[in-house]
């Protein structure tokens, strides 16, 4: 499928609107500090060049790869060295090393100001004044803050963002209409970003085989009626799409994702009975819908797995002939029978099966050796089941905020070297597993909870990788992708940690806390809780609870006071002294 001009090919496939949007996302994800106007200028230049190639594919430079064209364009940025430091060294390299270099400099936690939402009337005026610029700004601001956001999905978010403004800016109560929609998009966007970040980490840190194994398990759960060959084809295509997006090849990624959606809809009879509604939607909605589609019903009367994978005399022969195909079939057969298991559990089972075959197929009596392999699965299945049961009970007892606090204490004690903002962010997200998953019946709890926890722990891993401070975090993050959660669960209090020096400034609060939203106020209190544990890692739950209750009462009291600032100053000193005494600081 060779084209004389790759840039012309993609422009013709995607159209100018999508071409420009995707190039903007790509550039903003690479050069995260560049001003909006600079990116728009670069995008317009690339687009005009692409149009000359559409008109004549033999024109000068039209035969160059997209990486070469885009990299050359990024390297024209005058302030590259002063804004990005050593990233400027990438420009001295040749492709493909130059693109790899840009990828390595993507920053998961860029030093960018928090996005402040303007007044609704201000936003509506900006929207009406120039819809095109308004949408481009949205793409730019999200892409630079989320450098691995799944680009074709970001187009879908932008479409919904636009629809919200179109509807709400003509509503009687604009704010009541718009703000909940924007909140929903923000929350969904953060979740989408984190899910895609795990896919990219899986591909980049653990390789294509790891991603394909994940995809086989997930697609087999979702499409249990599909044949193994069909699932394998979907896995191959999906791997290509995500490899491209994670590699910064956003035009190819969006194009291939559209092709995959088209294929799935044309072949839905042999894939899933649940796709009908999705396939009636326009492209972006269709692709999103397919990605989120519910699991199809399992075929009736599926035979026991043991026959082919334990009892058969041909197990070692089949394994030796094509190891990954045989393991893929095992994973497919197990996953389609177990929509009640998390993907990571299914992958642990497949790994155990593989390890057993590696050992047993070299033994004197292979069959005797692997006959009890399924017995080894029992503890692997029970461990997440028990963990989820215990934590859901705790969540139901405490509610989300206090459940988050319990996790904050737990994780700060495990890895106290990790920065406080990271511990707060990650523990808050871990705590959301309760409201997200505990409401589900037993059969849906594990896939919801453990696969969500994989996404959240990956956030910890990528943030920690930027500035590594804990060998224990590094170990859990790098040893095994599927065992990250059990690895973190197994960590006990870090006995080697030297408690942090007490600093009264950390526990000094001001009247500005009173005007914060409930969420922001929670974050302030949770930040203080982490700092408290860092000072006194051996503090008991009861001690910490007492201090936090006093702290909550102190904030409530001073926020009701006439002279708030004086109250915070005077009562704050008393609280610090009382807390020090209570904790023996």
């Amino acid at each position: 499928d060779a084209h004389k001009s790759e840039v012309a090919h993609r422009f013709k496939d995607l159209g100018e609107e999508n071409f420009k949007a995707l190039v903007l996302i790509a550039f903003a994800q690479y050069l995260q500090q560049c001003p909006f106007e600079d990116h728009v200028k670069l995008v317009n230049e690339v687009t005009e060049f692409a149009k000359t190639c559409v008109a004549d594919e033999s024109a000068e430079n039209c035969d160059k790869s997209l990486h070469t064209l885009f990299g050359d364009k990024l390297c024209t940025v005058a302030t590259l060295r002063e804004t990005y430091g050593e990233m400027a060294d990438c420009c001295a390299k040749q492709e493909p090393e130059r693109n790899e270099c840009f990828l390595q400099h993507k920053d998961d936690n860029p030093n960018l100001p928090r996005l402040v939402r303007p007044e609704v009337d201000v936003m509506c005026t900006a929207f009406h004044d120039n819809e095109e610029t308004f949408l481009k700004k949205y793409l730019y601001e999200i892409a630079r803050r989320h450098p691995y956001f799944y680009a074709p999905e970001l187009l879908f978010f932008a479409k919904r963002y636009k629809a919200a403004f179109t509807e709400c800016c003509q509503a009687a109560d604009k704010a009541a209409c718009l703000l909940p929609k924007l909140d929903e998009l923000r929350d969904e966007g953060k979740a989408s970003s984190a899910k895609q970040r795990l896919k990219c980490a899986s591909l980049q840190k653990f390789g294509e085989r790891a991603f394909k194994a994940w995809a086989v398990a997930r697609l087999s759960q979702r499409f249990p009626k599909a044949e193994f060959a069909e699932v394998s084809k979907l896995v191959t295509d999906l791997t290509k799409v995500h490899t491209e997006c994670c590699h910064g090849d956003l035009l190819e990624c969006a194009d291939d994702r559209a092709d995959l959606a088209k294929y799935i809809c044309e072949n839905q009879d042999s894939i899933s009975s649940k796709l009908k509604e999705c396939c009636e939607k326009p492209l972006l909605e269709k692709s999103h819908c397919i990605a989120e589609v519910e699991n199809d019903e399992m075929p009736a009367d599926l035979p026991s797995l043991a026959a082919d994978f334990v009892e058969s005399k041909d197990v070692c022969k089949n394994y030796a002939e094509a190891k990954d195909v045989f393991l893929g079939m095992f994973l497919y057969e197990y996953a389609r029978r177990h929509p009640d298991y998390s993907v990571v559990l299914l992958l642990r089972l497949a790994k155990t099966y593989e390890t057993t075959l590696e050992k047993c197929c070299a033994a004197a009596d292979p069959h005797e050796c692997y006959a009890k392999v399924f017995d080894e699965f029992k503890p692997l299945v029970e461990e997440p089941q028990n963990l989820i049961k215990q934590n859901c009970e705790l969540f139901e007892q405490l509610g989300e905020y206090k459940f988050q606090n319990a996790l904050l204490v737990r994780y700060t004690k495990k890895v106290p070297q990790v920065s406080t903002p990271t511990l707060v962010e990650v523990s808050r997200n871990l705590g959301k597993v309760g409201s997200k998953c505990c409401k589900h019946p037993e059969a849906k709890r594990m896939p919801c909870a453990e696969d969500y926890l994989s996404v959240v722990l990956n956030q910890l891993c990528v943030l920690h990788e930027k500035t590594p401070v804990s060998d224990r975090v590094t170990k859990c993050c790098t040893e095994s992708l599927v065992n990250r959660r059990p690895c973190f669960s197994a960590l006990e209090v870090d006995e080697t940690y030297v408690p942090k020096e007490f600093n009264a400034e950390t526990f000094t609060f001001h009247a500005d806390i009173c005007t914060l939203s409930e969420k922001e106020r929670q974050i302030k209190k949770q930040t203080a809780l982490v700092e408290l544990v860092k000072h006194k890692p051996k503090a008991t739950k009861e001690q910490l609870k007492a201090v936090m209750d006093d702290f909550a009462a102190f904030v409530e009291k001073c926020c009701k006071a006439d002279d708030k600032e004086t109250c915070f100053a005077e009562e704050g000193k008393k609280l610090v002294a009382a807390s020090q005494a209570a904790l023996g600081l």
Epitope: G15, A21, E132
Partner: nanobody, 130 residues
Framework: HVQLVESGGGLVQAGGSLRLSCAAS???????RAWFRQAPGKEREFVAA????????YYTDSVKGRFTISRDDAKNTVYLQMNSLKPEDTAVYYC????????????????????????WGQGTQVTVSS
Amino acid sequence: HVQLVESGGGLVQAGGSLRLSCAASDTIDNYARAWFRQAPGKEREFVAAITWTFGTPYYTDSVKGRFTISRDDAKNTVYLQMNSLKPEDTAVYYCAASLYLPVRTASGGYRLDTDRPQYWGQGTQVTVSS
């Protein structure tokens, strides 16, 4: 081959309204849809366009504020709501599908050259009497 079919044209008095429709025979997700018009003895000119992904509208200066372009994803159809019609709006109105977007003019309106669209409809007559 994609076919574009226009409907909704007719005779209307000045100040009146008409709504044109353009249905596509097939999904062409990545193409902007546009309306052009050609008055007797004049060249075909751009009127309005809407992008397919985000639904961003573009208008030529002379119709801004009077005409509204919209789309229905599910029906694969584009509409041109024409209000406050003037005799100078009399023309054959053509629907088109274009990979390219309109470009901004110095006056702040938009234009799209007639060589840009990949697909054209047959046209529908709009006559505005004074």
